[in-house]
């Protein structure tokens, strides 16, 4: 009886997750006569085999890193070994799980900004890759200030954008840096995957240098003020 | 005068889990991030990870991910780290330890709680 | 991760004597790193930190030095109760890490 492991002959797609030890056989092939025997060709990467009989299987777990579709042939064999049937495309598709860690490009980044620049204007971009499909959770990363260095009776001077991880000012920071009182400040900045949103997600963290600058306009003024 | 008190010693069966505090005095609590240390064997030193009690962000050492949650309670001005499934590699002397808050002394750690022993066994 | 490397992993001397304890990280941190001094059954306490700034409270015969990948803590006139473990730190970049220490024995 042909039911959803087994069948005739024919172009087939099937989804498996990365990472999963083979437990279950893929498809069982029914040879018509005078097809006795089943052949596999392709992107097989000696991961995936076919019995003579006709049973397609994997013999370990897969990574959706290393491919993400394999492209299988079946053909079936007469008793001299000539094809009688097919060859079929056969696709087996890589299903993404989280099994890569988000990391930043960089270890420590250095940028400075010009004291009373606009809030939400980025001055400087920090970015990680993750290996995990972009498509899925896995692979969307959300980006967090843990901490600002000093905080000043508690006022965060600088933001992120979560998603593009761009660096900018705040309200508060456009009005209150000044480079005579603190020129420098440091941000540690983590990067999560999951969006952020799970228990489970990976992450890295990242150091940010910021030289806070005088506003030459500002300077300029008080220069023609004095003069 | 600044003051970080950690919770007693504790001495679980494997596959517990735990959760020891550190109790912060003598500064503003949410202007400065906590670090949590472990000790093994009387010798290694080992960074867990940081908690900024101001957002509750945190910063983990990849190692320690699914071993250790930390969190704070900014109303008693108290850290907490959760050590989850305690094997006997996991035996060891936790500290909780202050960052100093100047961006010029990257990352130091200016004050140290006293320490708590964990110790995992059957 | 950056590896820090600490040497001679004991130390044995004798009171008033000048001696070095060596931190070397697996790639340039610039001034980022620290020094702690661990005494029997205590927690460790802050030295030097950013390479050479010695915090207050610190005896002035304690000294930091260097920059890049290699550092030395010197201590001009070891007394008795120097003794302890010695411990770098890395605050360049994370994880945060610390070097296997220096043992400071008196013969």
């Known amino acids: 009886q042909e039911g959803k492991f087994s069948g005739p002959l024919k172009p087939m797609t099937f989804s498996i997750y990365e990472g999963q030890e083979p437990s279950q056989i893929i498809f069982q092939f029914k040879a018509n006569p005078p097809a006795v025997t089943f052949e596999l060709t392709g992107e097989t990467d000696n991961i995936f085999v076919i019995e003579r009989e006709g049973l397609l299987y994997y013999n370990r777990a897969l990574d959706r890193e290393t491919r993400s579709t394999h492209n299988l042939q079946v053909a079936a064999l007469d008793a001299n070994g000539i094809i009688v049937e097919g060859p079929v495309p056969i696709t087996i598709k890589v299903k993404d799980i989280n099994d890569n860690r988000p990391t930043f490009l960089q270890s420590k980044y250095e940028g400075s900004v010009r004291q009373n620049s606009r809030p939400g204007k980025p001055f400087l971009y920090v970015n990680a890759t993750d290996l995990d499909d972009p498509a899925t959770p896995n692979g969307q990363l959300y980006y967090q200030i843990v901490i600002q260095l000093p905080m000043i009776n508690n006022v965060m001077y600088f933001q992120i954008n979560n998603k593009t991880g761009a660096i900018s000012l705040t309200r508060e920071g456009s009005q209150e840096l000044n480079p005579a009182k603190n020129p420098s400040y440091n941000l540690v900045i983590s990067v999560k995957d999951m969006g952020g949103q799970s228990e489970n997600s990976f992450s890295d963290t990242t150091s940010v240098d910021i030289i806070v600058t005088e506003n030459i306009w500002k300077a300029h003024k008080h220069h023609h003020h004095h003069h | 005068e600044v003051q970080l008190q950690q919770s007693g010693p504790e001495l679980v069966k494997p596959g517990a889990s735990i959760k020891i505090s550190c109790k912060a005095s003598?500064?503003?609590?949410?202007?400065?991030?906590l670090n949590w240390v472990k000790q093994s064997h009387g010798k290694n030193l080992e960074w867990i990870g940081l908690?900024?009690?101001?957002?509750?962000?945190?910063s983990y050492n990849q190692k320690f991910k699914g071993k250790a949650t930390l969190t704070v309670d900014k109303s008693s001005s108290t850290a907490y780290m959760e050590l989850l499934s305690l094997t006997s590699e996991d035996s060891a002397v936790y500290y909780c330890a202050r960052w100093d808050g100047n961006p010029h002394y990257y990352y130091a750690m200016d004050y140290w709680g006293q320490g708590t022993s964990v110790t995992v066994s059957s | 991760d950056i590896v820090m490397t600490q040497s001679p992993a004991t130390l044995s001397v004798t009171p008033g004597d000048r001696v070095s304890l060596s931190c070397r990280a697996s790639?340039?941190?610039?001034?980022?790193l620290h020094w702690y001094q661990q005494k029997s059954h205590e927690s460790p306490r802050l030295l030097i930190k950013?390479?050479?700034q010695s915090m207050s409270g610190i005896p002035s015969r304690f000294s930091g030095s260097g920059s890049g990948s290699d550092f030395i803590l010197s201590i001009n006139s070891v007394e008795p109760e120097d003794v302890g473990m010695y411990y770098c730190?890395?605050?360049?970049?994370?994880?945060?890490?610390f070097g296997g220490g220096t043992k400071l024995e008196i013969k």
């Open positions: 908690i900024n009690p101001y957002n509750g962000g945190t």
């Open positions: 950013s390479g050479s």
């Open positions: 730190q890395n605050g360049h970049s994370f994880p945060l890490t």
């Open positions: 003598g500064y503003s609590f949410t202007g400065y991030a």
């Open positions: 790639q340039s941190i610039s001034d980022y």
